[in-house]
Interface confidence: low
């Protein structure tokens, strides 16, 4: 590529809107999935809008497996928080499943077949990493 | 983006090596899948190397569904041909499944869980579109 041009996203990532997404090919617990994303200068998936949710639902429509996202909470009395500490906006989606369970490792959210579920963070699942797309020439 | 810079691949496509790949979110027969790719200025997946195969196997590792690729043959006495008319290189992979079956619509190849299978082209499946990445400034 010409030197002053930079791709919006690295190879193997999907560019959508302002972000790049990588669907993991390995199955890990939530913390390891988070570390994997961090090693790629990214974070676990954060859904900011219904448009984001629509895209992700479409992107995983051909999978029946669960994917960790960057949403977790310490116990049922705590709010669902994204990795950056911001709360889940209730109009986006409702977390289903084991929402009132308490796990020593915390409760983490995964997306599967378009719905979001609560589960023990220690379980292994695929994951979705996300980082800002490079939308300027470098 | 700066005017003289063009992304290697459009949004929602995955850039890998010299190509862009799009995993369909809808399920169609082989011919309709081919038309869908053509409408996006692309073709159905063509695997040219073991590296290509490794990438595709990794990219669909979290799906248990079949994906049409651009490989078909009229009947068992014909060779497997890619859409551009080139033959399947035997060292790449072996087509499994209904290889000796004859179907009115022809026999088409799909990839599922890393292996390639023969099936009736009239059946519905997901698909993978592919086109050349734009690796130069425009």
């Amino acid at each position: 590529r010409v030197a002053n041009c930079s791709a919006p996203c690295p190879q193997d990532w999907i560019w959508h809107g302002e972000n790049c997404y990588l669907f993991s090919s390995g199955s890990f617990n939530w913390e390891n999935s988070q570390e994997k994303c961090l090693s790629l200068d990214a974070k676990l998936l954060k859904i900011n809008s219904t448009a984001d949710l629509d895209f992700i639902q479409q992107a995983i429509s051909y999978s029946s497996f669960p994917f960790w996202m960057g949403l977790s909470r310490r116990n049922p009395s705590y709010p669902w928080l994204w990795e950056d500490g911001s709360p889940l906006m209730p109009h986006l989606f409702r977390v289903r499943g084991a929402v009132s369970q308490t796990y020593p490792s915390g409760t983490c959210a995964y997306i599967q077949r378009g719905a979001v579920y609560a589960e023990n963070c220690i379980l292994a699942a695929f994951s979705i990493c996300q980082k800002k797309a490079n939308l300027r020439a470098q | 983006r700066v005017a003289n810079c063009s992304a290697p691949c459009p949004q929602d496509w995955i850039w890998h090596g010299e190509n862009c790949y799009l995993f369909s979110s809808g399920s169609f027969n082989w011919e309709n899948s081919q038309e869908k790719c053509l409408s996006l200025d692309a073709k159905l997946l063509k695997i040219n190397s073991t590296a290509d195969l490794d990438f595709i196997q990794q990219a669909i590792s979290y799906s248990s569904f079949p994906f049409w690729m651009g490989l078909s043959r009229r009947n068992p006495s014909y060779p497997w041909l890619w859409e551009d008319g080139s033959p399947l290189m035997p060292h790449l992979f072996r087509v499994r499944g209904a290889v000796s079956q004859t179907y009115p619509s022809g026999t088409c190849a799909y990839i599922q869980r890393g292996a390639v299978y023969a099936e009736n082209c009239i059946l519905a499946a997901f698909s993978i579109c592919q086109k050349k990445a734009n690796l130069r400034a425009q």
């Epitope: 116990n75 049922p76 009395s77 709010p79 669902w80 889940l88 209730p90 109009h91 929402v99 369970q101 | -």
Partner: antibody
Framework: QVQLVQSGAEVKKPGASVKVSCKVS????????MHWVRQAPGKGLEWMGG????????IYAQKFQGRVTMTEDTSTDTAYMELSSLRSEDTAVYYC??????????????????????WGRGTTVTVSS | QSVVTQPPSVSGAPGQRVTISCTGS?????????VHWYQQLPGTAPKLLIY???NRPSGVPDRFSGSKSGTSASLAITGLQAEDEADYYC???????????FGGGTKLTVL
């Protein structure tokens, strides 16, 4: 600091409806989850319903479902609780209350953790023929 | 009958320590939902005393403390004072009822 100002006392006949208001100041209503709690004379506190951050909607205690409606007028930052088909057992003080007011979080999701730290003074509703 | 149980009354002399228990189940306190405690003086609205099991809002004396274990929680008041005479309520969330629940209340009498 959040303050909740409730409407005045009401006397109603059995079968009628009552609508109690609760005006928020110091915050906007959309930043808070409003709940309604009642207390019959000489009895304990009874949760009637309120905004649930998990669902992003108002939920009602099973006992009151079908009889109670909780609404919000965000233009005036006022919450309302309407109870229909009144009977003598509904004679009580009705409180509006919100979590996380004093904590200043302004984040509805913290409700389960903070408890209801700001209360209105209560509205006495008497149901008598 | 409340799904969260408190003793109807407790009493203690000034300066003494008293505890009030709050017993729930696996669908509320035992499910991990936090417990909050309220104090209600006669003729006034309830006041939050303890939130999140053991945290005191600003202005609440450190004579009041809360704890939680398993399916139950307790409120402890040390150095009992005459002005502590009031009704005390615990509260949690119940996932099977999909709503908040209060204990039946405990009347504290300072002898």
């Amino acid at each position: 600091q959040v303050q909740l100002v409730q409407s005045g006392a009401e006397v109603k006949k059995p079968g009628a409806s009552v609508k109690v208001s609760c005006k928020v100041s110091g915050y906007t209503l959309t930043e808070l989850s409003m709940h309604w709690v009642r207390q019959a004379p000489g009895k304990g506190l009874e949760w009637m319903g309120g905004f649930d951050p998990e669902d992003g909607e108002t939920i009602y205690a099973q006992k009151f479902q079908g009889r109670v409606t909780m609404t919000e007028d965000t233009s005036t930052d006022t919450a309302y609780m309407e109870l229909s088909s009144l009977r003598s057992e509904d004679t009580a003080v009705y409180y509006c209350a919100t979590p996380n007011g004093q904590q200043g979080k302004g984040v509805r999701g913290w409700d389960y953790y903070y408890g209801m730290d700001v209360w209105g003074r209560g509205t006495t509703v008497t149901v008598s023929s | 009958q409340s799904v969260v149980t408190q003793p109807p009354s407790v009493s203690g002399a000034p300066g003494q320590r008293v505890t009030i228990s709050c017993t729930g189940s696996s669908s509320n306190i035992g499910a991990g939902y936090d417990v909050h405690w309220y104090q209600q003086l006669p003729g006034t609205a309830p006041k939050l005393l303890i939130y999140g099991n053991s945290n005191r809002p600003s202005g609440v004396p450190d004579r009041f403390s809360g704890s939680k274990s398993g399916t139950s929680a307790s409120l402890a008041i040390t150095g009992l004072q005459a002005e502590d005479e009031a009704d005390y309520y615990c509260q949690s969330y119940d996932s099977s009822l999909s709503g908040w629940v209060f204990g039946g209340g405990t009347k504290l009498t300072v002898l």
